[in-house]
Interface confidence: medium
């Protein structure tokens, strides 16, 4: 039987494609994707912009941030206010200060520690 | 478009900024404004970039740091202080807009800056 | 900053033949690497990015390759309307390694 080399096409993840010669091929990749083939995904992580301690997760053509408890954002860049997750945060009445990255509580009535518990 | 304004003949050692305006788009996430120059009949040279988006990243040529400074001044301007120039830094100045994702990148014609006594 | 070496300086070549240019990056930049082709008295154009994606209205006569620290670009058929300056340049922020320029490579065209 005749060998046609686009037929079926060995590009997957979307490529298209073109035949070059008799038994010759090459595909068209859609943007993320590399390879002969187009199986492979490029890894978009070597270009991140993750701060604060974010992990960079790939994606196609694109990446994520996971971000630390404390920040959130697309790049972790964005404070968490633990103030307002947390209503309780602080004990024996102390007040809650939200800080870049994290949280303090103002002790009151003779109370210490992170929490005013103590 | 970009367009770049600003570019005069100054003395040594006066700074001078440039300005960037962009036409026909405002800034937003997905790429950087940039500077790059190019001194009379020489290559190119990056100076310095800051992310289109709010978080509004910078990044400098290790040589740049301390003398010039890229900054957003609205949604569709960006402009580039340049402190303490030489003879050195006569060059046309470029602004780009850059991204690697895509290939949508945009330059403007630039302005001439020439710092002569 | 990441340094770009380009090879070669200029290259004189005839119309229709083959010219290919090598980037040496200082460090690896995975993918992260433009082309450039600039004429006298005009910003520059961009040819390739991604290392090897070909640009919006760029003919398929320009090609690139290469990743991590070893790139070329290479320009067949060449014509006359290929003379110009062409550059390299690394675009990736993850290690500050944004924007650094090869020297550049005259094409001249016999």
């Known amino acids: 039987s005749l060998y046609v080399p686009c037929a079926p096409s060995p590009c997957v993840n979307g490529g298209t494609c073109r035949q070059t010669g008799d038994f010759t091929f090459e595909c068209n990749c859609l943007p993320g994707f590399e390879g002969s083939t187009c199986e492979r995904n490029i890894d978009d992580c070597p270009n991140h912009r993750c701060q604060n301690g974010g992990v960079c997760v790939d994606g196609v053509n694109t990446y994520n941030c996971r971000c630390p408890p404390q920040w959130t954002g697309q790049f972790c860049t964005e404070d968490v206010d633990e103030c307002l997750l947390q209503p309780n945060a602080c004990q024996n009445g102390g007040t809650c200060a939200n800080r870049n990255g994290g949280y303090g509580c103002v002790c009151v009535n003779g109370w210490s520690g992170d929490d005013c518990s103590e | 478009s970009l367009e770049e304004s600003g570019g005069d003949l100054v003395k040594p050692g006066a700074s001078l900024t440039l300005t960037c305006t962009a036409s026909g788009f405002s800034f937003s996430s997905g790429y950087d404004m940039c500077w790059v120059r190019q001194a009379p009949g020489k290559g190119l040279e990056w100076i310095a970039c800051i992310y289109a988006g709010s978080e509004g990243f910078t990044y400098y040529a290790s040589w740049a740091k301390g003398r010039f400074t890229i900054s957003k001044s609205s949604s569709t301007t960006v402009t580039l202080q340049m402190t303490s120039l030489t003879v050195a830094d006569t060059a046309t100045y470029f602004c780009a807009r850059w991204t690697d994702s895509d290939g949508s990148n945009l330059w403007g014609p630039g302005t001439l800056v020439t710092v002569s006594s | 900053d990441v340094v770009m070496t380009q090879t070669p300086a200029s290259v004189e070549a005839a119309v229709g033949g083959t010219v290919t240019i090598k980037c040496q990056a200082s460090?690896?930049?995975?993918?992260?690497l433009a082309w450039y082709q600039q004429k006298p008295g005009q910003p520059p154009k961009l040819l390739i990015y991604r290392a090897s994606k070909l640009a919006s209205g760029v003919p398929s006569r320009f090609s690139g390759r290469g990743s991590g620290t070893q790139f070329t670009l290479t320009i067949s058929d060449l014509e006359c309307a290929d003379a110009a300056t062409y550059y390299c340049q690394s675009n990736s922020y993850g290690n500050n390694w944004v924007g650094g320029f090869g020297g550049g490579t005259k094409v001249e065209i016999k």
């Open positions: 460090q690896s930049i995975s993918s992260y």
